[in-house]
């Protein structure tokens, strides 16, 4: 008899697994782009915003050529975990203004969680070492003001958008090397 209903399919084709991760990443990228646009529309951004607690961008045009699958998946998972925590923090801490975008932020957080699970599954199927247990997460400080939390939201969505954009490119490139 085959595997019990509902159990994960054990794939013998890592390319198919990678495809599925790319699709999820692409979908999340589209969601993030849309939400970032909504944010800009609702709360116009006065220039670029940064948040020290966000991960630095792991990939760039210069590093695409030397990408290795284990490194990319590990780093991507660690960075997306950080963005997941930031979105979670934003939903709980940012004040009433951002509650108007609560359905979208909630959906974004759920999709991020789904992608994180997919990446973890992909790493185990490819027999890649799981990312070392995350360093104890540095608690995210309270926003200094409502205005500060809106700036933080712009920074989080902007950073996540860039990270996902590079992730799609990187994963597609790695797929051709498998």
């Amino acid at each position: 008899p085959g595997p019990p209903a509902g159990s994960p399919r054990v794939s013998s084709d890592p390319r198919a697994d990678l495809d599925s991760a790319v699709l999820l990443t692409r979908s999340l990228l589209a969601d993030t782009r849309q939400l970032a646009a909504q944010m800009r529309d609702k709360f116009p951004a006065d220039g670029d915003h940064n948040l020290d607690s966000l991960p630095t961008l792991a990939m760039s045009a210069g590093t695409l050529g030397s990408l290795q699958l284990p490194g990319v998946l590990t780093r991507l998972r660690v960075d997306l975990m950080s963005y997941f925590r930031h979105v979670q923090w934003l939903r709980r801490a940012a004040g009433p203004s951002l509650k108007t975008l609560e359905p979208e932020l909630g959906a974004l957080q759920a999709r991020l969680e789904r992608l994180l699970r997919r990446l973890q599954l992909l790493m185990s199927r490819l027999a890649l070492p799981q990312a070392a247990p995350d360093q104890p997460a540095v608690p995210l400080g309270p926003p200094a003001s409502a205005w500060g939390s809106i700036r933080a939201a712009h920074a989080i969505l902007g950073g996540l958008h860039l990270t996902l954009d590079w992730a799609v490119r990187g994963l597609l490139l790695l797929k051709t090397r498998l």
């Epitope: 709980r92 940012a94 509650k99 309270p142 200094a144 409502a146 500060g148 939390s149």
Partner: antibody, heavy 117, light 111 residues
């Protein structure tokens, strides 16, 4: 230092209107969401309304929805609460409070509104 | 009837540790941060705890907050006579789209 000073309270008849003001100083008023919270004599705290830092988003307690309007003038560093169709149960001390997120880090001293015929 | 449930009263003797509970639901305490306020007789409330367990500067470390699931609690250790006051818990409620408070707990310091 941060200061919030409410004014405009007094005795008013049921069905009439009153406008409360809250003058803010000691911080960048336009960066903060602002709330009104009230406390009936001998009772607990009851949240009334909040307005976002730039004034576009407003939320109200069900008990005041459609009767009260929260507004702000960032150029004057002032928060307002327009109270219409007042009822006896609106009698309370009204506090304005500043919030960086969902907690109130500074409160005014309060202004008493008495609705009585 | 308050959305968040607190015991109406609590008491202790100087030096004792007292805990005040605050019970809510998944739409408030379960998904948002809890804050606690102290209101001395005849004065405006004062922020004691925010973000579930953080203390603003100036609040003694005798006061601590914690949260688990849909309940939160405020602990006061080394009770002092000046701690006699009303204590309120609060959180945003996603279902009501507003802030909710507990009914308040009157703390009496005996002796």
């Amino acid at each position: 230092q941060v200061q919030l000073v409410e004014s405009g309270g007094g005795v008013v008849q049921p069905g009439r209107s009153l406008r409360l003001s809250c003058a803010a100083s000691g911080f960048t008023f336009s960066h903060y969401d602002m709330h009104w919270v009230r406390q009936a004599p001998g009772k607990g705290l009851e949240w009334v309304a909040v307005i976002s830092y730039e004034g576009s988003n407003k939320f109200y307690a069900d008990s005041v929805k459609g009767r009260f309007t929260i507004s702000r003038d960032n150029s004057k560093n002032t928060l307002y609460l327009q109270m219409n169709s007042l009822r006896a149960e609106d009698t309370a001390v009204y506090y304005c409070a500043r919030t960086p997120g969902f907690h109130f880090d500074y409160w005014g001293q309060g202004t008493l509104v008495t609705v009585s015929s | 009837q308050s959305v968040l449930t607190q015991p109406p009263s609590a008491s202790g003797t100087p030096g004792q540790r007292v805990t005040i509970s605050c019970s809510g639901s998944s739409s408030n305490i379960g998904s948002n941060y809890v804050s606690w306020y102290q209101q001395l007789p005849g004065t405006a409330p004062k922020l004691l705890i925010y973000y579930d367990d953080l203390r603003p500067s100036g609040v003694p470390d005798r006061f601590s907050g914690s949260k688990s699931g849909t309940s939160a609690s405020l602990a006061i250790s080394g009770l002092r006579s000046e701690d006699e006051a009303d204590y309120y818990c609060s959180a945003w409620d996603d279902s009501l789209s507003g802030v909710v408070f507990g009914g308040g707990t009157k703390l009496t310091v005996l002796g």
